[in-house]
Interface confidence: medium
């Protein structure tokens, strides 16, 4: 069927577009192009008569069109008004008409956008901030990025004005981030520089640490106050309502029962004008306080560090108990308890060891539980994954690679091309790539806390011509009726059709043959010896096609039930007995013979000269295939008669 393909479909202003004709009939009289979805003489662009090689411009001819002998139409120096449908009318030699319609869209190249804001220092839970992506551009899509991630779903985030304006209602401190806007149309994409939102917040209710409220006489009381605040808060301490000092920390040495009471920390933010207080009641006991857990390593590194959790305080003649994830301790060689059970050591921590952990002190009446403790296990980065998985791209498309590696804290990413550092982002974006963008693309993930780095390298090929494909196999020597074989056509390429041939023919219909992964993978289930054929894969796109070298499948099979020849079972005395055994097998089997159960020789042919009736009996041929691990055998009875006693007997070999 006659079809029109627009290359490209989305055209940038000033560029050119080719209306490419597919399945043009043979034996033509001529053809004509029209602007619009139908044949309309008033909108004819150009006509071409093959016999006279005469091209006749029509009313819609602009001087920017070139018609080719294959009927394709090139339109140069594209303008916005060129957007729309184009109809090709073909007249065959027998004056039969055919027509086909194609279309393309015209878009402008976009400038680099910028972000304007209506509020540079919003106050948390009070102000709204409206970011606007400039300039306003027709037929452009506006996108927003927060810390290089797409927008989270939130009722406080609202896009308006065709997504050009991003409004954050009731800003929170978590909105303090890097904001970027991006303008896109089908022919270009541009991102703005980042804008950092500085949200004024707090102070929150201060946190007094340590959380321990029970102390023994003679200890030092060292309280620290912290309130999340931007700008940082100013602190004041009150004991039982009486002002003590304007510091973040309160220190009282050698406390007594008289130091019991209410301890108040007040935090003040001079920009927001807000004050918040937190009160903790300190009790100074002569008896044991509520237990708590200390750790020798608050940020252990996975597979490297051990962590010792100690249940405080140390009290003589006390039973210490432990819980992980609200369960009693599991049995594990990586978990060790000290003799007094007060210290729990985790050997070679993993990311799954975060907890929470609790310890308890058992007394006569009850068990006092500590507050739970969660371990912050630093891990990774794991090997980065680069997506998408394509390795082959056509020129003119946008290359957008994303890298991700499991890591705590989150990994910092760097991209290198052919060993040259490009940028320190999780995503790499290159618009309108050419063959020059082919190369080795390396993503490096770095964990600043553990100091570990991991890299993944991906080969990107940019070519209008498809490369010669190759076939990879997951099993080079499959066993018949047992194994499956998966052939994969390499490389994986965008907008590419994958084809397969077996012995130069297209794939037969079979429930044992399955195509998957966009026809890239051909799986043969329960292979048979008949599958030992030449397999070829092919790749094609609108520009080119290529085939791999054949791969011949080596199917291991057998041994089948052997055949002993000749088929004769009766022999005359004095004849030679020459038995040959054969079994279909790959690789060739090993043969052995037994006569009346007694092992003979390990050969394919058994030869006995001048046999006598003593040679009567059962002759068994045994075959074994070391590759398939299978064996088989057959038994044949041989009768030897004295000369001249039995007619029709074999005279021997």
């Amino acid at each position: 069927k006659l079809t029109i393909e627009s290359t490209p479909f989305n055209v940038a202003e000033g560029k050119e577009v080719l209306l490419l004709v597919h399945n043009l009939p043979q034996h033509l009289f001529g053809y004509s192009w029209y602007k619009g979805e139908r044949v309309d003489g008033n909108r004819q662009i150009i006509g071409y008569v093959i016999g006279t090689q005469q091209a006749t411009p029509g009313p819609a001819y602009s001087g920017r069109e070139i018609i080719y002998p294959n009927a394709s139409l090139l339109i140069q120096n594209i303008i916005q008004n060129d957007t729309g449908f184009y109809t090709l009318h073909v007249i065959k030699s027998d004056l039969v008409n055919e027509e086909a319609t194609g279309q393309f869209r015209v878009y402008p190249e976009l400038p680099k956008p910028s972000i304007s804001s209506n509020n540079s220092k919003p106050v948390e839970d009070k102000d709204a901030v409206a970011f606007t992506c400039e300039p306003e551009t027709q037929d452009a899509t506006y996108l927003w990025w927060v810390n290089n991630q797409s927008l989270p779903v939130s009722p406080r985030l609202q896009l308006s004005n065709g997504n050009r304006t991003l409004t954050l209602f009731n800003v929170t401190r978590n909105d303090t981030a890097s904001y970027k806007c991006e303008t896109q149309n089908p022919v270009s994409a541009r991102r703005s520089d980042s804008v950092i939102l500085n949200v004024l917040y707090g102070p929150d209710a201060p946190t007094i640490s340590p959380l321990n409220t029970s102390y023994r006489s003679g200890e030092n009381l060292n309280l620290s106050c912290h309130a999340a605040s931007n700008p940082p808060a100013q602190y004041s301490w009150f004991v039982n309502g009486t002002f003590q000092q304007s510091t973040q920390e309160l220190f009282i040495p050698n406390i007594t029962v008289n130091n019991s009471g209410s301890y108040t920390c007040q935090a003040h933010n001079s920009d927001t004008g807000l004050n918040r207080t937190t009160v903790t009641t300190i009790t100074v006991y002569a008896e044991p306080p509520k237990p708590f857990i200390t750790s020798n390593n608050s940020n252990p590194v996975e597979d490297e560090d051990a962590v010792a959790l100690t249940c405080e305080p140390e009290i003589q003649n006390t039973t210490y108990l432990w819980w992980v994830n609200n369960q009693s301790l599991p049995v594990s060689p990586r978990l060790q308890l000290s003799n007094d059970n007060r210290t729990l050591t985790l050997l070679s921590v993993t990311r799954n060891d975060v907890g929470p952990y609790e310890c308890g002190i058992q007394n006569e009446l009850s068990v006092d539980h500590s507050d739970p403790v969660i371990l912050n296990v630093l891990y990774g980065p794991d090997d980065p994954t680069i997506s998408p998985s394509y390795t082959y791209y056509r020129p003119g498309v946008n290359l957008s690679l994303s890298c991700h590696a499991a890591s705590n804290p989150p990994a910092q990413y760097s991209w290198l091309i052919d060993g040259n550092i490009q940028q320190h982002t999780q995503e790499l974006f290159i618009s309108n790539i050419t063959e020059k963008n082919s190369g080795l693309y390396t993503c490096q993930a770095n964990n600043s806390a553990s100091g570990h780095s991991r890299t993944t390298v991906k080969t990107i090929t940019v070519s209008a011509e498809l490369p010669k494909p190759s076939i990879s196999s997951n099993n080079s020597k499959p066993v018949e009726d047992k194994d499956a074989v998966a052939f994969t056509c390499e490389p994986e390429a965008q907008n590419t059709t994958y084809l397969w041939w077996v012995n130069g023919q297209s794939l037969p219909v079979s429930p044992r043959l399955q195509l998957s992964n966009g026809n890239r993978t051909l799986t043969l289930f329960n292979v048979t010896r008949n599958d030992a054929r030449a397999y070829v894969c092919g790749i094609q796109n609108s520009v080119s096609a290529n085939r791999s070298d054949p791969v011949t499948l080596d199917v291991l099979y057998g041994p089948d039930t052997p055949i002993i020849s000749p088929p004769d079972s009766s022999y005359l005395s004095g004849a030679n007995l020459n038995l040959s055994c054969h079994s279909a097998s790959n690789p060739s089997p090993q043969y052995s013979w037994r006569i009346n159960g007694i092992p003979q020789q390990h050969t394919q042919v058994l030869f006995i000269a001048k046999i006598t009736p003593n040679n009567n009996g059962t002759y068994a041929c045994f075959v074994s295939n070391l590759a398939t691990g299978r064996n088989n055998s057959i038994v044949k009875s041989i009768t030897v008669s004295a000369s001249g006693t039995s007619p029709g007997l074999s005279a021997g070999a």
């Epitope: 009289f29 006509g47 030699s93 027998d94």
Partner: antibody
């Protein structure tokens, strides 16, 4: 000036044969598609056949397929219609006509004055 | 084959009238339709091709429209020389004609 002149019409018995000719002038005959259209007495127009500029492409109406043959001699600027196994229903005025060089879609822009073929016993 | 049906088969009108003749195809023929005028004893004359394109030398009072299956020939103001028989022809395959519309003086 484009001119098309048909000849060869006349009275013929059923089952007989006749060859019509059309002499062309005033245009480049060798690069033009040509056709025959007929009109039975008191009836409408019926397309009969067409031929490509190089004789390699021919088309026929179902009613005449297998009996009529269209041909041309570019050296003589002449179009022919060989009519065999004629029937009474083939009685008509036969017009020779030209398809123009830019025919999107096919149409007949110049016609001869016609020649009458009568099939009767 | 594609059948072409013209309506009306005959029509009486006066000089200066606006006249419309319609032609319907039994299946879609895109814009592949031509209109011809024939006067008694004369050869047909091409008026419109490709449904709406006016043949060179034909007066502008003749116009064609339509696409797909329904087509119209319009004479905006009848002149004495316009009284004739009008045929539509589909330019698909084969190139069949309609049965004709005879335009007579009222």
């Amino acid at each position: 000036e484009v001119q098309l002149l048909e000849s060869g019409g006349g009275l013929v018995q059923p089952g007989g044969s006749l060859r019509l000719s059309c002499a062309a002038s005033g245009f480049t005959f060798s690069s033009s598609y040509m056709g025959w259209v007929r009109q039975a007495p008191g009836k409408g127009l019926e397309w009969v056949s067409s031929i490509g500029s190089g004789s390699y492409s021919t088309s026929y109406a179902d009613s005449v397929k297998g009996r009529f043959t269209i041909s041309r001699d570019n050296s003589k600027n002449t179009l022919y219609l060989q009519m065999n196994s004629l029937r009474a229903e083939d009685t008509a005025v036969y017009y020779c006509a030209r398809y123009p060089s830019v025919l999107f879609p096919p149409h007949l822009d110049y016609w001869g004055q016609g020649t009458l073929v009568t099939v009767s016993s | 084959d594609i059948q072409m049906t013209q309506s009306p088969s005959s029509l009486s009108a006066s000089v200066g009238d606006r006249v419309t003749i319609t032609c319907r195809a039994s299946q879609s023929i895109s814009s592949y339709l031509n209109w011809y005028q024939q006067k008694p004893g004369k050869a047909p004359k091409l008026l419109i091709y490709a449904a709406s394109s006016l043949q060179s030398g034909v007066p502008s009072r003749f116009s064609g429209s339509g696409s797909g299956t329904d087509f119209t020939l319009t004479i905006s103001s009848l002149q004495p020389e316009d009284f004739a028989t009008y045929y539509c022809q589909q330019a698909g395959n084969p190139h069949t004609f309609g049965q004709g519309t005879k335009l007579e003086i009222k």
